[in-house]
Interface confidence: medium
């Protein structure tokens, strides 16, 4: 288990409040605020890294030790690397020292050297260099520390800088406890942990009510380390067959519950359409109608498969059609519900049908959906589409009825334009194109896709109302994909085949790809 | 001595474009974050765009955003500014910036950067 | 964006005079400020940056203090040199935006 963290300090959830002191006053150690991840972070930093005989100071406010024996001192600093700088900066460091004194009082902002012990030069694993420092990577480096055993009423920590390029972001001082434990239904008292133990204390638990020692097991005992951890766990207490753990203690089943083996889990009510069980089940049986999957665990109701989708619609828009529906209004108790969608269509001349799956493209694929949604599209124009939604879930298998809901509509799309190129040069293609005059009427404007061949990351779009464009601006003896879509108050109607054209080269040879 | 000589500025119609050059010399350019900030006549100073040394990350002023593209070819020591469909409000003198962070006595870098070499400027005049 | 305003927007000195420009950001910016200097027809020149770092090669008449929303550029003994534009830049946010100019005439 993990140790128990008693904070007496943390400059990092300060806020940039604490105010320490600085000695030689307004000179090395400078409180900043930065912002990393888009929120404002504090820091102490100097960076006095060109001017040699660097002693800067920077001294924590009195900190009450309280009942801390030992205490430990993370810091979460960034070192710029000495070769960032111009030159080298030859007087420049890379490290910085730690430093702590006791005391019974706090001296305010009489700053003495002498009062301080040293505890360690502090060196980072990582520096920052200048390619980092440029692209704003802080190279954190977290090292902590640890003094004891602390006898006076409280104590400073300070920094002193040599003539580095620091920062100063998180500076937390905590002592430890071994935190009072429940631990396999077995009860350890909390500990302090010792300042300098070499040996492990050693701690007694003991059994909640009505639960044992295992038939061949230790007696619980754990170790408190000096870090405040529990450690070294040995034997375990479980509640009695029939019992079930109940805040920290142990609990006969209740009628309508079962636990069929000696475990630290609890009793189980019996779950929803089974039947109910004597005291001491170790199962329950399913209701009439109702089934288990096989993978589905004793503890969840039984089920039964699902109602059919409860409101499905067809909405066309040119040559797709967007299936809307609602989950079944019984999900049959289960939450793994999908949905199938198959595809009809039928000729309106000739009344003949037959599936269409081979022959659309739908958004995502239409067996196993979750979501309540799906587009289908490259629908033909002039056909009536039957879409049909079924609704399963995990005990569907297990009946022969099927839950599904149907939707039909019809598809009146604009067909595809048909396109010519009329002329071209060096820089510029001029193209037309065509639609039946029936379908003219239905048309907005024309949408003109086009391309440079192999350049899949961008591609230019024109519009117009009128039957050709010339498309300008463009590099010489260069293919160009090149596709006409006609937009209707529908949306939009299917496109052409996608063209190959190519600019003339600047000698004015050069092929017409069509 | 760093050096930055700008060109490629002139009269061009709205609607138009341009591409501003900028060749640096004097320095290790690959070390430099570089930036293109404007001074319309007679008013202050505008932030346009930056790019890192090694070519990202790129930032535009909102003001230009979809409009300028900012390049560089560090083989050829060279900052570029591609300016489309040009207003009469780009109408500016377009100077090109650069800092190195080497310079900067700092232990953690300022959110973004300040310019500390900068070159004579070259003009801009959109106008029909 | 953030704002910078910066004020006077013009004074007029005598050489050898203390002149004190100030420049105000619309949030906290900490000390992520810098100021120039610009002459009519040249390019800005660095002066400051990081509110109070001197850059290299500029005169110890020029300084810069502030933090937070408040900043201001000294310059103690003004010299012919001196008249000029100054403005002020802040780069706690990408949009890197400037002071609109204080101008330091000829009294």
């Known amino acids: 288990a993990q140790g128990k963290e008693v904070v007496l300090l943390d400059f990092a959830a300060a806020g940039g409040e604490l105010g320490w002191l600085t000695h030689p006053y307004g000179k090395g150690w400078d409180l900043m605020q930065n912002i990393m991840n888009d929120m404002p972070i504090y820091m102490y930093s100097v960076c006095n890294v060109m001017s040699g005989d660097q002693d800067n100071w920077l001294r924590t406010n009195w900190v009450y030790r309280g009942e801390a024996e030992r205490i430990f001192i993370e810091l979460k600093f960034t070192v710029r690397d000495c070769n960032s700088f111009p030159g080298g900066a030859s007087s420049c460091k890379e490290t910085f020292n730690l430093y702590y004194a006791e005391s019974d009082l706090d001296y305010g902002t009489n700053f003495q050297k002498r009062l301080f012990t040293k505890i360690d030069t502090i060196a980072p694993d990582e520096i920052t260099v200048s390619s980092d420092f440029e692209a704003r990577h802080v190279k954190l480096n977290v090292e902590e520390r640890s003094v004891g055993p602390l006898t006076r009423k409280g104590f400073y920590l300070a920094f002193q800088d040599i003539g580095a390029c620091v920062a100063l972001l998180s500076v937390r001082v905590y002592y430890k406890k071994c935190p009072e434990l429940l631990q396999s239904l077995a009860r350890f008292p909390e500990t302090i942990a010792g300042s300098d133990a070499p040996s492990l204390a050693t701690v007694a638990g003991t059994c909640v009510d009505h639960a044992v020692v295992p038939p061949g097991g230790e007696e619980p005992r754990m170790h408190c380390a000096v870090d405040g951890e529990w450690l070294v766990p040995i034997g375990q207490c479980l509640c009695q067959a029939g019992y079930e753990k109940v805040e920290d203690a142990c609990q006969a089943c209740s009628p309508g519950f079962f636990k069929f083996e000696v475990s630290e889990s609890p009793c189980l009510e019996c779950p929803e359409h089974t039947l109910p069980s004597p005291e001491g089940a170790t199962s329950c049986e399913c209701e009439e109608g109702f089934f288990r999957a096989p993978q589905d665990p004793m503890s969840m109701p039984c089920t039964r498969p699902p109602s059919a989708p409860h409101y499905l619609t067809a909405v066309g828009m040119g040559a797709k059609v967007e299936l809307r529906w609602t989950p079944p209004q019984d999900s049959g108790g289960r939450e793994d519900i999908v949905y199938s969608v198959t595809c009809e269509q039928c000729w309106p001349e000739s009344g003949e049908c037959g599936p269409c799956e081979s022959s659309v493209r739908y958004s995502e694929p239409p067996h196993g959906l979750t979501r309540t949604s799906v587009t289908v599209s490259d629908l033909e124009p002039h056909m009536n589409y039957t879409f049909t939604v079924e609704a399963r879930n995990g005990v569907s298998g297990l009946v022969t009825s099927r839950s599904f809901r149907t939707a039909s509509v019809s598809i009146n799309q604009t067909e595809p334009p048909k396109v010519r190129l009329e002329g071209r040069s060096t820089t510029s293609l001029s193209v037309s194109w065509s639609i039946p005059p029936p379908q003219q009427s239905r048309v907005w404007k024309y949408e003109v896709t086009y391309r440079k061949k192999g350049d899949s990351n961008s591609y230019n779009v024109r519009r117009t109302e009128g039957f050709s464009v010339t498309l300008d601006d463009l590099a010489p003896d260069t293919t160009y994909l090149v596709q006409v879509q006609a937009l209707t108050q529908e949306g939009q109607g299917a496109g052409s085949k996608v063209h190959e054209f190519q600019t003339l080269s600047p000698e004015g040879s050069g092929s017409l790809a069509v | 001595e760093v050096q930055l000589l700008e060109s490629g500025g002139g009269l061009v119609q709205p609607g138009g474009s341009l591409r501003l050059s900028c060749a640096a010399s004097?320095?290790?350019?690959?070390?430099?974050?570089m930036a293109w900030v404007r001074q319309a006549p007679g008013k202050g100073l505008e932030w346009v765009s930056r790019?890192?040394?090694?070519?990202?990350?790129?930032h535009y002023a909102d003001s230009v955003k979809g409009r300028f593209t900012i390049s560089r070819d560090n083989s050829k020591n060279t900052l570029y500014l591609q300016m489309n469909s040009l207003r009469a409000e780009d109408t500016a003198v377009y100077y090109c910036?650069?800092?190195?962070?080497?310079?900067?006595?700092?232990?953690?870098?300022?959110?973004?950067?300040?310019?500390?070499?900068w070159g004579q400027g070259t003009l801009v005049t959109v106008s029909s | 964006d953030i704002q910078m305003t910066q004020s006077p927007s013009s004074l007029s000195a005598s050489v050898g005079d203390r002149v004190t420009i100030t420049c105000r950001a619309s949030?906290?910016?900490?000390?992520?400020l810098a100021w120039y200097q610009q002459k009519p027809g040249k390019a800005p020149k660095l002066l400051i940056y990081?509110?109070?770092n001197l850059h290299t090669g500029v005169p110890s008449r020029f300084s810069g203090s502030g933090s937070g929303t408040e900043f201001s550029l000294t310059i103690s003994g003004l010299q012919p040199d001196d008249f000029a534009t100054y403005y002020c830049?802040?780069?706690?946010?990408?949009?890197?935006?400037f002071g609109q100019g204080t101008k330091v005439e000829i009294k």
């Open positions: 990081k509110a109070s």
């Open positions: 004097g320095f290790t350019f690959s070390h430099y974050m």
């Open positions: 949030q906290s910016i900490s000390t992520w």
């Open positions: 790019i890192g040394p090694s070519g990202g990350p790129t």
């Open positions: 830049q802040q780069y706690q946010s990408y949009s890197r935006t």
């Open positions: 910036a650069g800092y190195d962070s080497g310079y900067d006595y700092v232990a953690v870098a300022g959110p973004a950067e300040y310019f500390q070499h």
